[in-house]
């Protein structure tokens, strides 16, 4: 805590200029005003305070504004906003996307902060929904933004926005989440025809049932090994090798190398060995010819 | 994002002379002052001299009026800090520093 002490004869600050920098931490708490700071808070970025500096005019702010910065002071935070506290940030009331970019970019090339996180909260909740423009704007600055979003929280995700989702942004999603996201993006892509459908459908399959995975098969769209081997394991079981083989195309080949890798393993479980012969890859483990198939789970549904 | 790397410092004699440098890439360097500061052994940063990259307006602390001269090069995004007339009070770590970046700082000793 910084004492309250006169300010010098000479040095009241009539503006915030980088002869501040030269100011001992009680000369600045004495000569800065606060009201004059919070105007000019754009010009505080340009100027290479020291953190000690920094927190004597943050001090300043909180003194000012105890329920909150208002938005004309946040939007100009600048690098000051490093020294806000998850805590600070939970009293703002955060509404223009421009805000909230100008706080990104201080941010910019780090991992996502807690206060970072609770700026997004704060803003996203304030929204109600995670419009198109906002998950433009968090997914450009943090790609894995999306997947760190629970399932409760996707389900606020309206169909339109999945447009600003790029295949990258999806990396780190587990089934849970797919499964949220793949039914809107199936929505949102409805109206496009089939390869464009599947270019734009692809990184969400993670999330597709078995009878989307078999429409697709029927439509030459040749699905690479690695966007297979992310489909859900109790989705593929039910596919036929000849469904497989469509789906996959020329990728079909790909099966020998992941043959011990969910879901081919367990998929290959569940095939006749004579189907899978007819690949002519080689694949072994599917069941002996003459074996009776029972679906157990077929069996306790009826019992 | 801007990258700061100092250079020039090392060990002189009171009296002597010493030029430090500031090599700055990545973002144009208009919109930001840029400073060279300085920190004591067991001592608070001090700032030592500023220059407004737009203005030209120069700022020296009073421990070093007359002694230190703080100038840029525009073309080589460099920013210098000519020393003069050392004495050993002025033995410290030299920071440059542009808006919120920091360099990792370069020594300086002045002994006999």
């Known amino acids: 805590e910084v004492e309250k002490t006169a300010c010098p004869s000479g040095k009241k600050a009539r503006e915030i200029d980088e002869s501040l920098i030269f100011y001992k931490k009680w000369e600045l708490e004495a000569c800065v005003d606060a009201a004059l700071l919070a105007t000019q808070m754009d010009r505080v970025n340009a100027i290479p305070f020291t953190y000690e500096q920094l927190d004597v005019l943050k001090h300043k702010l909180d003194e000012l504004y105890p329920q909150g910065y208002p938005e004309s002071v946040i939007q100009h935070l600048g690098y000051l906003f490093l020294k806000m506290s998850p805590e600070d940030i939970r009293k703002w009331n955060v509404t223009s996307l421009e805000t909230l970019k100008a706080l990104l970019e201080v941010n910019k090339g780090h991992e996502m902060s807690p206060q970072v996180a609770t700026l997004i909260d704060r803003f996203v909740k304030g929204r109600g929904q995670l419009d198109k423009d906002t998950l433009d704007t968090l997914t450009a600055f943090y790609p894995g933004y999306l997947c760190s979003l629970s399932p409760e929280e996707l389900s606020s995700v309206p169909p339109s926005s999945i447009w600003a989702v790029r295949p990258q942004d999806l990396d780190t999603c587990d089934p849970r989440q797919l499964d949220v996201l793949y039914p809107k993006a199936r929505l949102a892509f409805q109206n496009m025809n089939g390869s464009e459908y599947f270019v734009k459908i692809q990184s969400f399959l993670g999330g597709a049932p078995t009878e989307d995975l078999k429409a697709l098969s029927q439509q030459n769209v040749s699905m690479d090994l690695a966007t297979f081997m992310k489909l859900r394991t109790d989705a593929v079981l039910p596919l036929t090798v000849a469904e497989v083989q469509k789906l996959l195309g020329p990728h079909v080949e790909g099966l020998k190398a992941e043959e011990r890798h969910r879901p081919v393993r367990d998929w290959i479980l569940r095939q006749r060995q004579d189907d899978l012969d007819t690949l002519g890859l080689g694949l072994q483990g599917g069941i002996p010819n003459g074996y009776l198939v029972l679906d157990l789970s077929m069996q306790e549904a009826l019992s | 994002q801007v990258q700061l790397v100092e250079s020039g410092g090392g060990l002189v004699q009171p009296g002597g002379s010493l030029r430090l440098s500031c090599a700055a890439s990545g973002r144009t360097l208009e919109s930001y002052v840029m400073a060279w500061f300085r920190q004591a052994p067991g001592k608070g940063l001090e700032a030592v001299a500023s220059?407004?990259?737009?203005?030209?307006?120069?700022i020296y602390a009073d421990s070093v009026k007359g002694r230190f001269t703080i100038s840029r090069d525009n073309s080589k995004n460099t920013l210098y800090l000519q020393m003069n007339s050392l004495r050993a009070e002025d033995t410290a770590v030299y920071y440059c520093?542009?808006?919120?970046?920091w360099g990792q700082g370069t020594q300086v000793t002045v002994s006999s």
């Open positions: 220059i407004n990259w737009s203005s030209g307006r120069l």
């Open positions: 520093a542009a808006g919120r970046y």
